[in-house]
C-alpha cells in the first residue's frame, strides 16, 4: 500500500495522532497516540 | 451503501437568502469533512468553502467570505450552506462533497435559480 | 487562495490521438492534484488522484504525472466516449479547480 504524509489542508484531522494519506485507498487514515481511539483520535479510552 | 442526499431545487428572488441541506447515510459526518462545490450553467466547477463537522471549523473561499455559511448538524449527520445576498450570477448547481476518509464523494446537486 | 492555470481551454482531436491537458499551480502542491471528467447533466467522476493515482473501473488510457507546480493529464488514445470537460483540483491547501478543458472529436 503506497501512504504519504496528509495534505496541509488536513492539519488538526487527526485529534490526538498522525495523519497518513493512503493512496491507493484515496483516504486519510489517523494513526492514534496510546489512549486514544475513533476515525480522527477524538476518543480516550484508559 | 454511502449517500450525501442533497434538498430540492429552489427559486430565490434577488437579494433573498437560500439554505441547501446535505444528508450523510452509511456514515457518520463526523468523520470527514464536507466541501461545497458550485457550478453555474455552462461555467466550471468552483469551490466555496468546507466544514469539519467535528470541530465545528469552517474555511471559506475568499470571494464568498460573510456571503456564505456552512453548518452542520451531527445529530441528523446533515451539513447546510446559506448563501445570502443572492443575486443573478448565484445561479448554479451546488454540490456537497464528502473527503477525509474517502477522496471526493459527490452529492447529486441542488440547483438554485436566483431570478426576479 | 492557490490558482491553478488549466490549459488549453477546449481542443478537438481525431479518435485514437493522444490528448494532453496541463494545470499549472501558483506554488507547490506536492502532488495532490485529482482530475475530473464531466459530461453534460451529469455530476463530475474522478479520475485520477494524488497526481497518478487511477481510480476503480476508470480505463488505463487516462494518466497523469507531474510535481512541484506542473501537472499533466493524458488520453493516451482517445474514444468517442471520451468526449466531456476535464477538470484538474489542487487539494493541497483547501481547494480550487482549474477553469476546464473542453475535450470533442474532429
Known amino acids: 500500500v503506497s501512504i504519504t504524509k496528509c495534505n496541509s489542508d488536513m492539519n488538526g484531522y487527526c485529534l490526538h495522532g498522525q495523519c497518513i494519506y493512503l493512496v491507493d485507498m484515496s483516504q486519510n487514515y489517523c494513526r492514534c497516540e496510546v489512549g486514544y481511539t475513533g476515525v480522527r483520535c477524538e476518543h480516550f479510552y484508559l | 451503501q454511502d449517500q450525501l442526499v442533497q434538498s430540492g431545487a429552489e427559486v430565490k428572488k434577488p437579494g433573498a437568502s437560500v439554505k441547501v441541506s446535505c444528508k450523510a447515510s452509511g456514515f457518520n459526518i463526523k468523520d470527514t469533512y464536507i466541501q461545497w462545490v458550485r457550478q453555474a450553467p455552462g461555467q466550471g466547477l468552483e469551490w466555496m468553502g468546507r466544514?469539519?463537522?467535528?470541530?465545528?471549523?469552517?474555511k471559506y473561499r475568499e470571494k464568498f467570505e460573510g456571503r456564505v455559511t456552512i453548518t452542520a448538524d451531527t445529530s441528523t449527520n446533515t451539513a447546510y450552506m446559506e448563501l445570502s445576498s443572492l443575486r443573478s450570477e448565484d445561479t448554479a448547481v451546488y454540490y456537497c462533497?464528502?473527503?477525509?476518509?474517502?477522496?471526493?464523494?459527490w452529492g447529486q446537486g441542488t440547483l438554485v435559480t436566483v431570478s426576479s | 487562495d492557490i490558482q491553478m492555470t488549466q490549459s488549453p481551454s477546449s481542443l478537438s482531436a481525431s479518435v485514437g490521438d493522444r490528448v494532453t491537458i496541463t494545470c499549472k499551480a501558483s506554488q507547490d502542491i506536492h502532488k495532490y492534484i485529482a482530475w475530473y471528467q464531466q459530461k453534460p447533466g451529469q455530476a463530475p467522476r474522478l479520475l485520477i488522484q494524488y497526481t497518478s493515482t487511477l481510480q476503480p473501473g476508470v480505463p488505463s488510457r487516462f494518466s497523469g504525472s507531474g510535481s512541484g507546480t506542473d501537472y499533466t493529464f493524458t488520453i493516451s488514445s482517445l474514444q468517442p466516449e471520451d468526449i466531456a470537460t476535464y477538470y484538474c483540483l489542487q487539494y493541497d491547501r483547501l481547494r480550487t479547480f482549474g477553469g476546464g478543458t473542453k475535450v470533442e472529436i474532429k
Open positions: 462533497v464528502r473527503s477525509g476518509t474517502l477522496f471526493d464523494f
Open positions: 466544514i469539519d463537522p467535528l470541530r465545528g471549523n469552517t
